[in-house]
């Protein structure tokens, strides 16, 4: 069913994300003690490593395209602060129409 399909997509996206983060860390010279925000998979989408003060924008994830194939992609942002990543804005539920609970069921 669609839930099993979406679960498969999220697992694939997560694996790709971890690879992307590793490559980005190498390119940017990031390590565990570097200032800034480490790349992360937040159970919805992938966030590349960022420097303090940087705002990162991502499109709503692949699952969103399946449910809404004909529409403009929503965009979610996070700021990299001295305290780490900010909350996403807008929240996924309002930007994309679904949230993390659906990806876990």
């Amino acid at each position: 069913g669609s839930m099993a399909h979406s679960d498969g997509i999220f697992k694939k996206e997560q694996a790709m994300c971890l690879e992307k983060i590793q490559r980005a860390n190498e390119l940017m010279g990031f390590n565990d003690s570097s200032p800034g925000c480490p790349g992360m998979w937040d159970n919805i989408t992938c966030w590349k490593p960022a420097h303090v003060g940087e705002m990162v924008l991502v499109s709503c994830p692949e699952l969103f395209r399946i449910f809404n194939p004909d529409q403009d992609m929503g965009v979610v942002s996070r700021n990299c602060t001295e305290d780490g990543w900010s909350e996403p804005f807008p929240h996924y539920f309002d930007a994309c129409g679904f949230d993390e609970y659906e990806s876990e069921t």
Partner: antibody, heavy 123, light 107 residues
């Protein structure tokens, strides 16, 4: 055809609890595609979104900060309805209260509304 | 919270007129905007969502446009049943917030 039917008292005393119910026909409160919202309207504050509940494998609520400490929205799956409770009311809570269904298509919008209930807070 | 403002607050028009109502958000909201019509003693009725998409069953004389902070609702060839109050509402971030409304009455 989706319909929302509101019920509850129209007069509440200050410091007491305002309780309203919204009965859903033509849809289910447990739908994975909808949200269930409460909104109020008064001359002084205009239209004010109060909160929502929705089911996506588990129940989740979101509330407006202005009422967060006083509000509870509860789904009742056995009757396919949802309720609003607002504690410690004051005359400023006097308003017409509406329930509404939220649906998604590029954004969340409120496509079906209850008939509205005028609630007066007065002793 | 995101503040929504509308102009004008009221306008007088005649049947057959073309009218435009403007809504402005205090910060960019992309196209996460809906328009509603309300008649006295009734609940609001959805007209437009996602800035420009017409709700099913709404006549095509209603149209929406805009993105970011500035939006417009246009009614072409105003009909007698269109005399009402119109509200915009942002849906990018909770709490959802509404404009104060624009009352359209008969000239």
């Amino acid at each position: 055809q989706v319909q929302l039917q509101q019920s509850g008292p129209g007069l509440v005393k200050p410091s007491q609890t305002l309780s309203l119910t919204c009965a859903i026909s033509g849809d289910s409160v447990s739908s994975r595609y909808a949200t269930w919202n409460w909104i109020r309207q008064s001359p002084s504050r205009g239209l004010e979104w109060l909160g929502r509940t929705y089911y996506r494998g588990q129940w989740k609520n979101h509330y407006a900060v202005s009422v967060k400490s006083r509000i509870t929205i509860n789904p009742d799956t056995s009757k396919s309805q949802f309720s609003l409770q607002l504690n410690s009311v004051t005359p400023e809570d006097t308003a017409v209260y509406y329930c509404a269904r939220g649906m998604w298509n590029q954004n969340w919008f409120l496509d079906h509304w209850g008939q509205g209930t005028l609630v007066t807070v007065s002793s | 919270d995101i503040q929504m403002t509308q102009s004008p607050s009221s306008l007088s028009a005649s049947v057959g007129d073309r009218i435009t109502i403007t809504c402005r958000a205090s910060q960019p909201i992309s196209r996460y905007l809906s328009w509603y019509q309300q008649k006295p003693g009734k609940a609001p009725k959805l007209l437009i969502f996602a800035g420009q998409r017409l709700q099913s069953g709404i006549p095509s004389r209603f149209s929406g446009s805009g993105s970011g902070t500035d939006f417009t609702l246009t009614i072409n060839s105003l009909q007698p049943e269109d005399f009402a109050t119109y509200f915009c509402q942002q849906a990018i971030s909770i709490p959802y917030t509404f404009g104060p409304g624009t009352k359209v009455d008969i000239k």
